[in-house]
């Protein structure tokens, strides 16, 4: 059985597109199973992974390896 | 369950803004996009944009791009909307809605808030 | 940007009809489609997506199809809880466009 594009697994019912951009980064494994790309994580991997040792309380990162502060903190790690 | 509760009814003066509030329940808040839609009375849905809460990232609809700022707090799980300029065509139920698993599309709405905009 | 062109825009029926509503996009979106129902002073219900995948709790009297650029909602024996404003919305990139809307009233 030859499952139509972005349809994969038994019965062609699991669903999976590669795509990177806002709305996700990551490719599909060959059971349909979103892997996410380097830097990137989340059930839809659309979030980014911070600086290593970002506070996960006064910090933040919209692009992988980022860490911005909230207001009034500051740092490399904004703690 | 996943929930999102809308803030209540506004009622605006053209040219004013307006802030639409979202809570999210029931699912980790930095995991989805949060997206808006809106609807003029006896029209049809509209894509806005979203917001990504983790990191708050944005992607916007270029028809609104300049007057929407969409906005989220980690701390209490709340998504705002905030609508400048506004003008009478801005009058509209406003919908926070969410993506399903697994890359469904919006299977989570709040119920709307109506924003009437009048002098 | 993706249009969405929706047909008919309203279409009266009656119970036990078989309906069929129908969704073309400007540009192929590779089965990236979602179709809605709506009933008054309502948010939007999910009803399928991927173009032919049935949400959570949906009758199965509801169905869809198509590829490429071309897509249909079938209501096979149409319910009194069925008369509202179906939706077509694709979601292969932004904007996700919507389509007009179709109002499905009892005829």
């Known amino acids: 059985v030859t499952c139509d594009d972005y349809y994969y697994g038994f019965g062609c019912n699991k669903f999976c597109r590669p795509r990177d951009d806002f709305f996700g980064h990551y490719a599909c494994d060959q059971n349909g199973n979103k892997t996410c790309m380097e830097g990137w994580m989340g059930p839809e991997c659309n979030r980014a992974i911070c600086r290593q040792g970002c506070s996960p309380k006064h910090g933040s990162c919209k692009l992988p390896g980022d860490c911005r502060c909230q207001y009034g903190w500051q740092g490399l790690y904004c703690d | 369950q996943v929930q999102l509760v809308q803030s209540g009814a506004e009622l605006k003066k053209p040219g004013s803004s307006v802030k639409v509030s979202c809570k999210a329940s029931?699912?980790?808040?930095?995991?989805?996009?949060m997206h808006w839609v809106r609807q003029a009375p006896g029209q049809g849905l509209e894509w806005m944009g979203a917001?990504?809460?983790?990191?708050?990232?944005?992607a916007y609809n270029q028809k609104f791009k300049g007057r929407v700022t969409l906005t989220a707090d980690k701390s209490t799980s709340t998504a705002y909307m905030e609508l400048s300029s506004l003008r009478s065509e801005d009058t509209a139920v406003y919908y926070c809605?969410?993506?399903?698993?697994?890359?469904?599309?919006?299977?989570?709405w709040g119920q709307g808030t109506l924003v009437t905009v009048s002098s | 940007d993706i249009q969405m062109t929706q047909s008919p825009s309203s279409l009266s029926a009656s119970v036990g009809d078989r309906v069929t509503i129908t969704c073309r996009a400007s540009?192929?979106?590779?089965?990236?489609l979602a179709w809605y129902q709506q009933k008054p002073g309502k948010a939007p219900k999910l009803l399928i997506y991927?173009?032919?995948t049935l949400a959570d709790a949906v009758p199965s009297r509801f169905s869809g199809s198509g590829s490429g650029t071309d897509y249909t909602l079938t209501i096979s024996s149409l319910q009194p809880e069925d008369f509202a404003t179906y939706y077509c919305?694709?979601?292969?990139?932004?904007?996700?466009?919507f389509g007009q809307g179709t109002k499905l009233e009892i005829k």
């Open positions: 991927n173009a032919k």
């Open positions: 917001i990504q809460p983790g990191g708050g990232g944005t």
């Open positions: 809605t969410r993506r399903g698993y697994d890359d469904y599309p919006f299977a989570y």
């Open positions: 919305q694709h979601f292969w990139s932004a904007p996700w466009t």
């Open positions: 029931g699912y980790t808040f930095t995991d989805y996009e």
């Open positions: 540009g192929n979106i590779h089965n990236y």
